[in-house]
Protein backbone atom coordinates (compact mmCIF):
# COMPACT_ATOMS: atom_id res chain seq x y z
CA UNK A 1 0.00 0.00 0.00
CA UNK A 2 1.20 3.29 -0.78
CA UNK A 3 0.78 6.03 1.53
CA UNK A 4 2.22 9.38 0.07
CA UNK A 5 3.25 12.87 2.42
CA UNK A 6 4.88 15.54 1.40
CA UNK A 7 8.83 15.41 0.87
CA UNK A 8 9.48 18.70 2.05
CA UNK A 9 8.38 19.71 6.34
CA UNK A 10 5.39 21.46 7.18
CA UNK A 11 5.88 24.77 8.74
CA UNK A 12 3.58 25.98 11.20
CA UNK A 13 3.25 29.65 13.11
CA UNK A 14 2.72 28.72 17.00
CA UNK A 15 -0.14 29.57 17.87
CA UNK A 16 -1.76 28.55 14.67
CA UNK A 17 -2.89 25.34 13.26
CA UNK A 18 -1.28 22.87 10.95
CA UNK A 19 -2.25 20.18 8.20
CA UNK A 20 -0.10 16.98 8.31
CA UNK A 21 -0.94 15.58 4.53
CA UNK A 22 -1.02 12.10 4.61
CA UNK A 23 -3.10 10.15 1.53
CA UNK A 24 -3.47 6.72 0.90
CA UNK A 25 -4.98 5.17 -2.70
CA UNK A 26 -7.75 3.19 -1.73
CA UNK A 27 -8.50 -0.49 -3.48
CA UNK A 28 -11.57 -0.85 -5.69
CA UNK A 29 -14.95 -1.54 -3.33
CA UNK A 30 -12.60 -0.44 0.03
CA UNK A 31 -14.99 0.93 2.92
CA UNK A 32 -13.96 2.34 6.04
CA UNK A 33 -14.92 -0.21 8.20
CA UNK A 34 -11.76 -1.70 6.57
CA UNK A 35 -9.14 1.03 7.57
CA UNK A 36 -6.89 1.07 10.23
CA UNK A 37 -5.31 3.81 10.89
CA UNK A 38 -2.28 5.51 13.16
CA UNK A 39 -1.13 8.48 13.69
CA UNK A 40 1.86 8.24 15.86
CA UNK A 41 5.59 9.91 17.06
CA UNK A 42 7.91 8.43 14.45
CA UNK A 43 10.44 8.50 17.28
CA UNK A 44 8.61 8.01 20.84
CA UNK A 45 6.19 5.93 18.58
CA UNK A 46 3.61 7.79 21.08
CA UNK A 47 -0.01 7.91 19.95
CA UNK A 48 -1.05 10.54 18.26
CA UNK A 49 -4.49 9.93 16.62
CA UNK A 50 -5.95 6.81 15.46
CA UNK A 51 -9.35 5.15 13.47
CA UNK A 52 -10.40 1.57 13.18
CA UNK A 53 -13.33 -0.14 13.18
CA UNK A 54 -15.22 2.14 10.96
CA UNK A 55 -14.84 4.88 13.85
CA UNK A 56 -12.35 7.82 14.84
CA UNK A 57 -10.56 7.10 18.03
CA UNK A 58 -10.14 10.44 18.59
CA UNK A 59 -7.09 12.32 19.45
CA UNK A 60 -4.50 10.84 22.22
CA UNK A 61 -2.49 14.11 21.76
CA UNK A 62 -3.36 16.81 24.15
CA UNK A 63 -7.09 16.76 22.48
CA UNK A 64 -5.36 19.29 19.76
CA UNK A 65 -5.75 16.74 16.91
CA UNK A 66 -8.42 15.88 14.15
CA UNK A 67 -8.86 14.02 11.26
CA UNK A 68 -11.07 15.05 8.25
CA UNK A 69 -13.75 12.35 8.12
CA UNK A 70 -15.38 13.27 5.28
CA UNK A 71 -12.12 12.53 2.93
CA UNK A 72 -11.18 9.55 4.94
CA UNK A 73 -13.36 7.13 2.23
CA UNK A 74 -11.23 9.31 -0.56
CA UNK A 75 -7.89 8.18 0.79
CA UNK A 76 -7.24 11.57 2.73
CA UNK A 77 -6.00 10.69 6.00
CA UNK A 78 -4.31 14.07 6.74
CA UNK A 79 -4.24 15.16 10.15
CA UNK A 80 -4.94 18.46 11.78
CA UNK A 81 -3.03 19.36 14.48
CA UNK A 82 -4.88 22.98 16.50
CA UNK A 83 -2.60 25.47 18.32
CA UNK A 84 0.49 24.28 17.80
CA UNK A 85 3.10 24.48 19.97
CA UNK A 86 7.30 24.89 19.86
CA UNK A 87 7.12 21.15 21.64
CA UNK A 88 5.01 19.90 18.54
CA UNK A 89 7.41 20.15 16.48
CA UNK A 90 9.21 16.83 15.09
CA UNK A 91 8.40 13.76 12.67
CA UNK A 92 4.74 12.35 12.71
CA UNK A 93 4.24 8.97 10.62
CA UNK A 94 1.32 8.23 9.54
CA UNK A 95 0.46 4.33 9.09
CA UNK A 96 -2.24 2.65 7.45
CA UNK A 97 -3.83 -0.72 7.09
CA UNK A 98 -6.04 -2.26 5.00
CA UNK A 99 -5.74 -5.60 3.38
CA UNK A 100 -1.87 -4.36 2.34
CA UNK A 101 -0.34 -1.38 4.97
CA UNK A 102 2.20 1.04 4.87
CA UNK A 103 3.63 4.24 6.00
CA UNK A 104 5.10 7.16 5.55
CA UNK A 105 6.60 10.06 8.10
CA UNK A 106 5.64 13.95 7.49
CA UNK A 107 8.28 16.70 9.29
CA UNK A 108 6.55 19.91 11.60
CA UNK A 109 8.64 22.39 11.75
CA UNK A 110 7.62 24.64 13.97
CA UNK A 111 7.90 28.47 13.94
CA UNK A 112 7.46 32.11 15.01
CA UNK A 113 8.51 35.57 13.75
CA UNK A 114 10.85 37.50 15.97
CA UNK A 115 9.49 41.24 16.96
CA UNK A 116 11.15 44.04 15.81
CA UNK A 117 14.69 44.68 17.60
CA UNK A 118 14.68 47.06 20.25
CA UNK A 119 17.49 48.92 20.86
CA UNK A 120 19.51 50.41 23.89
CA UNK A 121 22.57 52.52 24.71
CA UNK A 122 24.60 52.17 27.86
CA UNK A 123 25.39 55.19 28.60
CA UNK A 124 22.98 57.20 26.90
CA UNK A 125 24.04 60.27 27.85
CA UNK A 126 26.26 63.22 27.14
CA UNK A 127 28.20 60.90 24.42
CA UNK A 128 31.66 62.28 23.21
CA UNK A 129 33.59 60.86 20.18
CA UNK A 130 36.08 58.28 21.73
CA UNK A 131 33.48 57.03 24.49
CA UNK A 132 33.13 53.00 24.28
CA UNK A 133 29.25 52.64 24.52
CA UNK A 134 27.70 48.94 24.27
CA UNK A 135 24.11 48.94 22.11
CA UNK A 136 22.30 45.95 23.03
CA UNK A 137 19.55 44.14 20.31
CA UNK A 138 16.64 42.76 21.69
CA UNK A 139 13.96 40.78 20.01
CA UNK A 140 11.51 38.69 21.28
CA UNK A 141 9.39 35.22 21.18
CA UNK A 142 11.24 33.93 18.11
CA UNK A 143 11.43 29.93 17.06
CA UNK A 144 13.95 28.72 15.59
CA UNK A 145 16.68 30.12 17.44
CA UNK A 146 17.70 33.36 15.59
CA UNK A 147 21.16 34.37 13.65
CA UNK A 148 21.70 38.17 14.32
CA UNK A 149 24.06 40.11 12.23
CA UNK A 150 25.41 43.67 13.02
CA UNK A 151 26.48 46.17 10.18
CA UNK A 152 27.28 50.16 9.88
CA UNK A 153 25.66 52.93 8.17
CA UNK A 154 27.84 51.75 5.14
CA UNK A 155 26.48 48.20 5.58
CA UNK A 156 30.00 46.96 6.47
CA UNK A 157 29.39 43.90 8.46
CA UNK A 158 30.68 44.25 12.11
CA UNK A 159 31.65 41.37 13.47
CA UNK A 160 34.33 42.05 16.50
CA UNK A 161 32.98 42.50 20.09
CA UNK A 162 29.29 41.21 19.32
CA UNK A 163 27.87 38.59 22.82
CA UNK A 164 24.97 37.19 21.63
CA UNK A 165 22.72 35.15 23.86
CA UNK A 166 19.22 33.68 22.95
CA UNK A 167 16.88 32.22 26.03
CA UNK A 168 13.86 29.82 26.42
CA UNK A 169 10.72 30.82 27.59
CA UNK A 170 8.36 28.15 29.21
CA UNK A 171 7.09 27.54 25.63
CA UNK A 172 10.10 26.94 24.05
CA UNK A 173 10.63 30.63 21.99
CA UNK A 174 13.69 32.45 22.18
CA UNK A 175 14.32 36.27 23.90
CA UNK A 176 17.69 37.06 21.74
CA UNK A 177 19.89 39.87 22.97
CA UNK A 178 22.79 41.12 21.25
CA UNK A 179 25.67 43.20 22.47
CA UNK A 180 27.98 45.48 20.33
CA UNK A 181 30.64 47.58 22.27
CA UNK A 182 31.99 50.02 20.11
CA UNK A 183 33.94 53.19 20.01
CA UNK A 184 32.34 56.47 19.01
CA UNK A 185 33.27 58.34 15.95
CA UNK A 186 31.78 61.68 14.88
CA UNK A 187 28.72 60.32 14.65
CA UNK A 188 27.70 56.37 13.35
CA UNK A 189 24.66 54.13 13.08
CA UNK A 190 24.79 50.49 13.72
CA UNK A 191 21.98 48.19 12.49
CA UNK A 192 20.97 45.09 13.98
CA UNK A 193 19.46 41.76 12.21
CA UNK A 194 17.60 39.81 13.65
CA UNK A 195 16.88 36.54 10.69
CA UNK A 196 14.27 33.72 11.35
CA UNK A 197 16.31 30.64 9.24
CA UNK A 198 12.68 28.91 8.62
CA UNK A 199 10.23 31.67 7.92
CA UNK A 200 13.74 33.32 5.74
CA UNK A 201 11.84 36.85 7.80
CA UNK A 202 14.70 39.66 9.00
CA UNK A 203 13.84 41.79 11.42
CA UNK A 204 15.87 44.61 11.64
CA UNK A 205 16.30 48.18 13.88
CA UNK A 206 19.62 50.92 13.92
CA UNK A 207 20.19 53.25 16.14
CA UNK A 208 22.48 56.75 15.17
CA UNK A 209 24.56 58.09 17.40
CA UNK A 210 25.30 61.39 17.02
CA UNK A 211 27.80 62.56 20.14
CA UNK A 212 26.99 66.27 21.70
CA UNK A 213 25.77 67.88 24.40
CA UNK A 214 22.15 69.21 24.65
CA UNK A 215 22.23 73.12 25.58
CA UNK A 216 22.55 74.19 29.51
CA UNK A 217 18.79 73.77 30.99
CA UNK A 218 17.27 72.40 27.95
CA UNK A 219 15.14 69.38 28.39
CA UNK A 220 15.99 66.96 25.55
CA UNK A 221 13.00 64.43 24.93
CA UNK A 222 14.13 61.76 22.91
CA UNK A 223 12.12 59.05 21.10
CA UNK A 224 12.80 56.48 18.22
CA UNK A 225 13.10 57.84 15.03
CA UNK A 226 11.70 54.81 13.33
CA UNK A 227 8.28 53.32 14.52
CA UNK A 228 8.21 51.08 17.10
CA UNK A 229 6.29 47.74 16.04
CA UNK A 230 4.83 45.35 18.20
CA UNK A 231 2.99 41.61 17.32
CA UNK A 232 -0.53 41.67 18.76
CA UNK A 233 -1.12 40.40 21.95
CA UNK A 234 2.54 41.24 23.15
CA UNK A 235 3.67 44.03 25.24
CA UNK A 236 5.42 46.96 23.68
CA UNK A 237 7.91 49.65 25.03
CA UNK A 238 7.53 52.98 23.56
CA UNK A 239 11.00 54.63 24.77
CA UNK A 240 11.30 57.90 25.50
CA UNK A 241 13.89 60.02 27.66
CA UNK A 242 15.03 63.09 28.66
CA UNK A 243 18.22 64.43 30.15
CA UNK A 244 17.72 65.77 33.60
CA UNK A 245 19.39 68.70 35.11
CA UNK A 246 22.37 68.49 38.21
CA UNK A 247 20.04 68.10 40.99
CA UNK A 248 17.06 66.82 39.59
CA UNK A 249 14.37 65.02 41.94
CA UNK A 250 11.39 63.00 40.89
CA UNK A 251 9.32 65.71 42.77
CA UNK A 252 10.07 68.10 40.34
CA UNK A 253 9.01 65.50 37.20
CA UNK A 254 5.75 66.41 34.87
CA UNK A 255 5.58 63.44 32.73
CA UNK A 256 2.60 62.83 30.49
CA UNK A 257 1.96 60.29 27.33
CA UNK A 258 -1.00 61.00 25.60
CA UNK A 259 -2.53 60.05 22.37
CA UNK A 260 -0.92 62.78 19.56
CA UNK A 261 -3.84 63.42 17.49
CA UNK A 262 -6.60 63.28 20.01
CA UNK A 263 -4.54 64.34 23.02
CA UNK A 264 -6.01 61.72 25.07
CA UNK A 265 -4.13 61.10 28.52
CA UNK A 266 -2.81 57.64 28.40
CA UNK A 267 -0.39 58.13 31.28
CA UNK A 268 0.85 60.76 34.17
CA UNK A 269 3.19 61.47 36.00
CA UNK A 270 3.28 64.17 38.62
CA UNK A 271 3.89 65.72 42.02
CA UNK A 272 6.53 63.05 42.29
CA UNK A 273 3.66 60.21 41.99
CA UNK A 274 2.80 57.87 39.43
CA UNK A 275 -1.20 58.88 38.30
CA UNK A 276 -1.61 55.79 36.94
CA UNK A 277 -3.26 54.72 33.71
CA UNK A 278 -5.80 56.03 32.21
CA UNK A 279 -5.61 54.20 28.95
CA UNK A 280 -7.61 51.01 29.07
CA UNK A 281 -5.27 50.07 32.42
CA UNK A 282 -2.70 48.38 29.84
CA UNK A 283 0.06 51.36 30.53
CA UNK A 284 2.93 51.74 33.07
CA UNK A 285 5.81 53.41 33.21
CA UNK A 286 9.29 52.23 34.29
CA UNK A 287 9.73 53.58 37.90
CA UNK A 288 12.94 53.01 38.96
CA UNK A 289 13.99 54.47 35.98
CA UNK A 290 12.72 57.79 35.68
CA UNK A 291 15.26 60.12 37.96
CA UNK A 292 17.73 58.57 34.81
CA UNK A 293 15.79 60.15 32.45
CA UNK A 294 14.21 57.02 31.12
CA UNK A 295 10.39 58.23 30.94
CA UNK A 296 9.41 54.75 28.73
CA UNK A 297 5.83 53.54 28.52
CA UNK A 298 5.22 50.12 28.24
CA UNK A 299 2.02 49.31 26.65
CA UNK A 300 0.19 45.30 27.18
CA UNK A 301 -1.54 43.25 25.24
CA UNK A 302 -1.13 45.41 21.80
CA UNK A 303 -4.27 45.90 19.73
CA UNK A 304 -4.58 46.87 16.12
CA UNK A 305 -6.52 49.76 17.57
CA UNK A 306 -3.52 51.25 19.26
CA UNK A 307 -1.82 51.91 16.38
CA UNK A 308 -0.78 55.50 15.70
CA UNK A 309 1.27 58.01 17.39
CA UNK A 310 1.74 58.58 20.84
CA UNK A 311 3.35 61.65 22.30
CA UNK A 312 5.76 61.98 25.17
CA UNK A 313 5.74 65.49 27.36
CA UNK A 314 7.91 66.22 29.99
CA UNK A 315 8.32 69.11 31.84
CA UNK A 316 10.71 70.07 34.67
CA UNK A 317 12.08 73.62 34.40
CA UNK A 318 12.28 73.82 30.92
CA UNK A 319 9.67 71.43 29.03
CA UNK A 320 9.83 69.16 25.60
CA UNK A 321 7.82 66.85 23.81
CA UNK A 322 8.41 64.03 21.05
CA UNK A 323 6.37 61.70 19.38
CA UNK A 324 6.81 57.95 19.13
CA UNK A 325 4.66 55.70 16.35
CA UNK A 326 3.68 52.40 17.11
CA UNK A 327 3.04 49.68 14.04
CA UNK A 328 0.72 47.12 15.14
CA UNK A 329 1.53 44.09 12.89
CA UNK A 330 0.36 40.34 13.06
CA UNK A 331 1.51 37.34 10.74
CA UNK A 332 0.12 35.50 8.51
CA UNK A 333 -1.05 32.11 8.50
CA UNK A 334 0.97 29.80 6.39
CA UNK A 335 -1.78 29.88 2.89
CA UNK A 336 -4.04 27.04 2.61
CA UNK A 337 -5.06 26.09 -1.25
CA UNK A 338 -8.01 25.06 -2.80
CA UNK A 339 -9.03 24.28 -6.13
CA UNK A 340 -12.38 24.36 -7.92
CA UNK A 341 -13.33 22.00 -9.55
CA UNK A 342 -11.12 19.23 -7.51
CA UNK A 343 -11.93 16.14 -9.31
CA UNK A 344 -11.15 14.66 -12.35
CA UNK A 345 -8.90 17.29 -13.97
CA UNK A 346 -7.59 17.39 -17.40
CA UNK A 347 -5.19 19.88 -18.96
CA UNK A 348 -7.36 22.65 -20.83
CA UNK A 349 -9.69 22.93 -18.29
CA UNK A 350 -10.45 25.91 -16.28
CA UNK A 351 -9.57 26.11 -12.33
CA UNK A 352 -10.14 28.32 -9.84
CA UNK A 353 -7.67 27.92 -7.61
CA UNK A 354 -7.85 29.97 -4.06
CA UNK A 355 -5.07 31.16 -1.64
CA UNK A 356 -6.11 32.00 2.01
CA UNK A 357 -4.10 33.19 4.87
CA UNK A 358 -5.73 34.25 8.12
CA UNK A 359 -5.74 37.30 11.07
CA UNK A 360 -2.49 38.91 9.72
CA UNK A 361 -2.09 42.55 10.11
CA UNK A 362 -1.44 45.05 8.09
CA UNK A 363 -2.85 44.55 4.94
CA UNK A 364 -0.90 41.91 3.14
CA UNK A 365 0.50 42.23 -0.41
CA UNK A 366 -0.22 38.86 -2.45
CA UNK A 367 1.84 37.45 -5.31
CA UNK A 368 1.31 34.49 -7.69
CA UNK A 369 3.64 32.74 -9.37
CA UNK A 370 4.07 29.42 -11.65
CA UNK A 371 6.66 26.92 -11.09
CA UNK A 372 9.34 28.44 -12.83
CA UNK A 373 8.30 31.79 -10.93
CA UNK A 374 7.14 33.72 -13.20
CA UNK A 375 4.89 36.20 -11.82
CA UNK A 376 1.03 35.55 -12.36
CA UNK A 377 -0.71 38.51 -12.99
CA UNK A 378 -3.85 38.17 -14.92
CA UNK A 379 -6.95 36.84 -13.78
CA UNK A 380 -6.42 37.56 -9.66
CA UNK A 381 -9.03 38.60 -7.68
CA UNK A 382 -7.84 39.25 -4.04
CA UNK A 383 -10.15 40.44 -0.80
CA UNK A 384 -9.19 40.93 2.13
CA UNK A 385 -11.50 41.39 5.47
CA UNK A 386 -10.92 43.00 8.95
CA UNK A 387 -12.42 40.90 11.49
CA UNK A 388 -13.58 42.69 15.19
CA UNK A 389 -10.08 43.26 16.34
CA UNK A 390 -9.12 44.58 13.14
CA UNK A 391 -6.98 41.69 12.12
CA UNK A 392 -7.58 40.79 8.07
CA UNK A 393 -8.44 37.17 6.45
CA UNK A 394 -7.04 37.53 3.04
CA UNK A 395 -8.50 35.49 -0.04
CA UNK A 396 -6.76 35.13 -3.47
CA UNK A 397 -8.28 33.38 -6.35
CA UNK A 398 -6.32 32.85 -9.33
CA UNK A 399 -8.50 31.57 -12.40
CA UNK A 400 -5.80 29.28 -15.33
CA UNK A 401 -6.66 27.10 -17.82
CA UNK A 402 -4.49 24.16 -17.15
CA UNK A 403 -1.46 22.91 -19.24
CA UNK A 404 0.02 18.95 -19.32
CA UNK A 405 0.88 19.99 -15.71
CA UNK A 406 1.87 22.77 -13.70
CA UNK A 407 2.83 24.66 -10.20
CA UNK A 408 0.95 27.24 -8.77
CA UNK A 409 2.36 29.80 -5.50
CA UNK A 410 0.85 32.14 -3.58
CA UNK A 411 3.27 34.27 -1.24
CA UNK A 412 1.15 36.48 1.59
CA UNK A 413 3.71 39.36 2.05
CA UNK A 414 2.89 41.12 5.63
CA UNK A 415 4.64 44.61 4.59
CA UNK A 416 5.58 45.34 7.94
CA UNK A 417 7.26 42.20 9.77
CA UNK A 418 8.41 41.05 5.79
CA UNK A 419 6.95 37.87 6.80
CA UNK A 420 6.31 35.79 3.51
CA UNK A 421 3.90 32.99 4.14
CA UNK A 422 3.51 30.55 0.55
CA UNK A 423 1.50 27.92 -0.24
CA UNK A 424 1.59 26.60 -3.69
CA UNK A 425 -0.16 23.29 -5.68
CA UNK A 426 0.93 21.07 -8.00
CA UNK A 427 -1.39 20.33 -10.61
CA UNK A 428 -0.41 16.49 -12.85
CA UNK A 429 -1.17 16.34 -16.76
CA UNK A 430 -3.34 13.08 -16.23
CA UNK A 431 -6.95 12.87 -14.76
CA UNK A 432 -6.19 13.82 -11.22
CA UNK A 433 -7.84 14.60 -7.93
CA UNK A 434 -7.08 17.78 -5.69
CA UNK A 435 -5.40 17.69 -2.86
CA UNK A 436 -3.26 14.58 -3.92
CA UNK A 437 -1.53 14.14 -0.88
CA UNK A 438 -4.60 15.84 1.84
CA UNK B 1 16.58 88.29 39.82
CA UNK B 2 15.24 88.08 36.37
CA UNK B 3 13.64 91.59 34.92
CA UNK B 4 10.69 91.11 31.97
CA UNK B 5 9.69 94.11 30.18
CA UNK B 6 6.75 93.45 27.59
CA UNK B 7 5.57 95.12 24.71
CA UNK B 8 3.21 95.91 21.61
CA UNK B 9 -0.17 96.00 22.86
CA UNK B 10 -2.67 98.51 21.65
CA UNK B 11 -5.99 98.36 20.22
CA UNK B 12 -6.68 96.43 17.39
CA UNK B 13 -9.97 96.11 15.08
CA UNK B 14 -11.17 92.49 15.40
CA UNK B 15 -10.04 90.18 12.62
CA UNK B 16 -6.55 91.85 13.20
CA UNK B 17 -3.40 91.01 14.31
CA UNK B 18 -0.54 91.71 16.63
CA UNK B 19 2.85 90.73 17.89
CA UNK B 20 4.18 91.12 21.50
CA UNK B 21 7.36 91.09 22.93
CA UNK B 22 8.88 90.45 26.05
CA UNK B 23 12.18 91.45 26.86
CA UNK B 24 14.19 89.68 29.60
CA UNK B 25 17.22 91.04 31.56
CA UNK B 26 19.48 89.49 34.96
CA UNK B 27 19.87 86.19 33.76
CA UNK B 28 20.73 83.31 30.95
CA UNK B 29 17.68 83.62 29.16
CA UNK B 30 18.86 80.86 27.33
CA UNK B 31 18.36 78.85 29.78
CA UNK B 32 14.63 79.77 30.97
CA UNK B 33 11.52 78.48 29.29
CA UNK B 34 9.42 81.42 28.75
CA UNK B 35 5.08 81.76 28.74
CA UNK B 36 2.82 83.57 28.26
CA UNK B 37 -0.68 84.55 30.23
CA UNK B 38 -3.24 86.86 29.97
CA UNK B 39 -6.06 88.19 32.49
CA UNK B 40 -9.53 89.57 30.99
CA UNK B 41 -11.08 92.33 32.98
CA UNK B 42 -13.36 90.33 35.87
CA UNK B 43 -11.69 87.20 35.04
CA UNK B 44 -8.60 85.13 36.39
CA UNK B 45 -5.31 84.84 34.59
CA UNK B 46 -5.33 82.15 32.24
CA UNK B 47 -2.55 80.19 29.81
CA UNK B 48 -1.63 81.19 26.21
CA UNK B 49 1.02 79.47 25.41
CA UNK B 50 4.72 78.39 26.37
CA UNK B 51 8.10 78.11 24.79
CA UNK B 52 11.18 75.94 25.75
CA UNK B 53 14.61 77.07 26.65
CA UNK B 54 16.24 76.69 23.30
CA UNK B 55 12.75 77.36 21.10
CA UNK B 56 12.33 73.79 20.13
CA UNK B 57 9.03 72.71 22.05
CA UNK B 58 6.19 74.81 22.48
CA UNK B 59 2.60 74.30 24.23
CA UNK B 60 -0.67 76.20 23.52
CA UNK B 61 -3.90 76.55 25.10
CA UNK B 62 -6.14 74.52 23.03
CA UNK B 63 -8.61 78.11 22.66
CA UNK B 64 -5.40 79.60 20.99
CA UNK B 65 -3.43 76.83 18.90
CA UNK B 66 -3.81 77.92 15.61
CA UNK B 67 -4.10 81.99 15.85
CA UNK B 68 -1.29 82.56 18.39
CA UNK B 69 2.68 81.47 17.48
CA UNK B 70 5.24 81.81 20.56
CA UNK B 71 8.55 82.47 19.77
CA UNK B 72 12.13 83.28 20.71
CA UNK B 73 15.18 84.81 19.52
CA UNK B 74 17.91 84.02 22.73
CA UNK B 75 20.65 86.24 21.23
CA UNK B 76 18.24 89.01 21.71
CA UNK B 77 16.74 87.26 25.13
CA UNK B 78 13.41 88.24 23.86
CA UNK B 79 10.21 86.01 23.79
CA UNK B 80 7.27 86.96 21.02
CA UNK B 81 3.68 86.42 21.16
CA UNK B 82 2.11 86.46 17.40
CA UNK B 83 -1.54 87.08 17.67
CA UNK B 84 -4.17 87.13 14.50
CA UNK B 85 -7.50 86.67 14.12
CA UNK B 86 -8.15 88.51 16.66
CA UNK B 87 -11.61 88.48 18.61
CA UNK B 88 -13.23 90.78 21.15
CA UNK B 89 -12.65 88.03 24.12
CA UNK B 90 -8.89 88.52 23.37
CA UNK B 91 -8.79 91.68 25.21
CA UNK B 92 -6.69 91.51 28.23
CA UNK B 93 -3.64 92.40 29.92
CA UNK B 94 -0.94 90.25 28.58
CA UNK B 95 2.06 88.72 30.77
CA UNK B 96 4.84 86.98 29.86
CA UNK B 97 6.59 84.88 32.65
CA UNK B 98 9.56 82.30 33.36
CA UNK B 99 9.56 78.96 33.87
CA UNK B 100 10.40 76.96 37.22
CA UNK B 101 9.45 73.88 38.17
CA UNK B 102 5.73 72.20 37.00
CA UNK B 103 3.64 72.22 34.17
CA UNK B 104 3.77 74.94 31.21
CA UNK B 105 0.13 75.61 31.36
CA UNK B 106 0.03 76.71 35.66
CA UNK B 107 0.70 80.21 36.85
CA UNK B 108 2.52 78.55 40.08
CA UNK B 109 5.38 77.00 37.69
CA UNK B 110 6.62 80.20 37.26
CA UNK B 111 8.95 82.37 39.28
CA UNK B 112 9.09 86.12 37.17
CA UNK B 113 6.51 87.78 35.88
CA UNK B 114 6.32 91.06 34.31
CA UNK B 115 4.01 93.94 34.33
CA UNK B 116 2.04 93.17 31.56
CA UNK B 117 1.12 94.98 28.29
CA UNK B 118 -2.80 95.69 27.20
CA UNK B 119 -4.05 94.38 24.30
CA UNK B 120 -8.18 95.95 23.09
CA UNK B 121 -10.24 94.13 20.49
CA UNK B 122 -13.06 96.32 19.19
CA UNK B 123 -14.82 97.68 15.96
Known amino acids: LEVQVPEDPVVALVGTDATLCCSFSPEPGFSLAQLNLIWQLTDTKQLVHSFAEGQDQGSAYANRTALFPDLLAQGNASLRLQRVRVADEGSFTCFVSIRDFGSAAVSLQVAAPYSKPSMTLEPNKDLRPGDTVTITCSSYQGYPEAEVFWQDGQGVPLTGNVTTSQMANEQGLFDVHSILRVVLGANGTYSCLVRNPVLQQDAHSSVTITPQRSPTGAVEVQVPEDPVVALVGTDATLRCSFSPEPGFSLAQLNLIWQLTDTKQLVHSFTEGRDQGSAYANRTALFPDLLAQGNASLRLQRVRVADEGSFTCFVSIRDFGSAAVSLQVAAPYSKPSMTLEPNKDLRPGDTVTITCSSYRGYPEAEVFWQDGQGVPLTGNVTTSQMANEQGLFDVHSVLRVVLGANGTYSCLVRNPVLQQDAHGSVTITGQPMTFPPEA | EVQLVESGGGEVQPGGSLRLSCAASGGTFSSYAMGWFRQAPGKEREFVAAISSEGGSTYYAESMEGRFTISRDNAKNTVYLQMSSLRAEDTAVYYC????????????????WGQGTLVTVKP
Open chain 2, 97 to 112: AVKGVGWPQEQASYDY
